[in-house]
């Protein structure tokens, strides 16, 4: 029961996390104009991974996509790649984990197969979460670096002096959404991996005992075998009675759980 709960909770947490990663990737507020110590302006800039937006004081908002690949910073491209990889891995992980859920029966799928699928999806969620956290962290680092580098440079022109200032940008809402979502996906993945351990079936060896009657008076006695889990002290099946009976271990070196008397 605890295994099912852990697996189910891991799935739900990962689902929320991946939905968050998708939301963060699509959001426009990855970086927002830093208004602290800025002269009053009539526009507010904010940017995402895919487009740049401006909100005027009148309330009018306009966005324009980055219709180029070569003109974009390499770091931005790297962040895009990390987020997409995270989403793809997460989506595949979700698909695998649906079939791995203990509460869902699909044909005659064995517990060992479900355990393997649970582990696979768990690893996928972990990698997905790490990709999202890495992507958001790389972007945050880029913002911090730009923030301190955005100092005024003076260019002397023919008609006088022109001051070029790069507007300072700070963390947008998407970064926090991405960090939290990545963390949730990571936690969900860990939970799935923990659930996998509980799903793996215990090896039960049914060691059958064959009876060879030494005389005509000795009849076959049913129930002449014991099941052993292999974890107890009774790893060898004892003889039920004397009179030609010997354990299957003495006859067959590789007992199978399908060997019945």
């Amino acid at each position: 029961m605890a295994v099912t709960a852990c697996q189910g909770l891991g799935f739900v947490v990962s689902l929320i996390g991946i939905a968050g990663i998708i939301a963060a990737t699509c959001m426009d507020q990855w970086s927002t104009q830093d208004l602290y110590n800025n002269p009053v302006t009539a526009v507010f800039n904010y940017q995402g991974l895919w487009r740049s937006c401006v909100r005027e004081s009148s309330g009018f908002t306009e966005c324009r996509g980055y219709f180029t690949l070569l003109g974009l910073p390499a770091m931005l491209q790297a962040v895009r790649a990390l987020m997409i990889v995270g989403i793809v891995l997460g989506a595949i992980g979700l698909l695998v984990s649906i079939f791995a859920l203990k509460c869902i029966r699909i044909g005659s799928m064995e517990d060992s197969a479900k355990a393997n699928m649970t582990l696979t999806s768990g690893i996928m969620f972990i990698v997905s979460g790490l990709c999202a956290i890495a992507g958001v962290s790389v972007f945050a680092n880029m913002l911090v670096t730009n923030f301190w580098m955005s100092t005024a440079n003076m260019y002397t022109g023919m008609g006088g002096m022109v001051q070029t200032v790069q507007t300072r940008y700070t963390f947008g809402a998407a970064l926090f959404v991405g960090w939290v979502a990545g963390g949730l996906t990571l936690i969900g993945g860990v939970m799935m991996c923990i659930a996998c351990r509980g799903l793996a079936p215990e090896e039960t060896n049914y060691k059958a005992v064959s009876y060879h009657a030494s005389g005509h008076s000795v009849a076959y006695k049913p129930g002449g075998f014991k099941a052993s889990t292999g974890f107890g002290s009774n790893t060898k099946n004892k003889k039920i009675y004397d009179g030609g009976a010997r354990t299957e271990d003495e006859v067959q070196s590789y007992p199978s759980k399908h060997d019945y008397v």
Epitope: S31, T41, A42, V43, N45, Q47, S52, V54, E56, S58, F60, R64, Y66, T68, G71, L72, P73, L76, N146, S150, G157, V162, Q163, T164, V165, Q166, T167, R168, Y169
Partner: nanobody, 122 residues
């Protein structure tokens, strides 16, 4: 090379008018929002007016509303500020500034001119 050159400043009597111009070069003016700022002697820089890259969305500081008009001509790469009913408190150095509207995945650039002095005195 980026240049923003203001002109049209001077001495004017209270109630008079002036038209400031700002000629831009060295960048794609038509993709930049533009502003006028001013700095009175011994005071901080103050926002005066804004106009977006298409020539719409004009916004003004309360102190200049209904007296000043901002406009631009993208074909001439020039920004204008028509100042009417000037008062003594309008005395300041006026700066034009261009703000990149849609930067490509990096912080937008702001370009500032060197300023032109407007003195309102009788």
């Amino acid at each position: 090379q980026v240049q923003l050159v203001e002109s049209g400043g001077g001495v004017v009597q209270p109630g008079g008018s002036l038209r400031l111009s700002c000629a831009a070069s060295g960048f794609t003016f038509s993709t930049y929002d533009t502003n006028w700022y001013r700095q009175a002697p011994g005071k901080g820089r103050e926002f005066v007016a804004f106009i977006n890259y298409r020539g719409g969305g004009a916004t003004y500081a309360d102190s200049v509303k209904d007296r000043f008009t901002i406009s631009r001509d993208n074909s001439k790469n020039t920004l204008y500020l028509q100042m009417n009913s000037l008062r003594a408190e309008d005395t300041a150095v006026y700066y034009c500034a261009a703000h990149e509207r849609f930067p490509m995945g990096r912080p937008p650039y702001d370009y500032w001119g060197q300023g032109t002095l407007v003195t309102v005195s009788s």
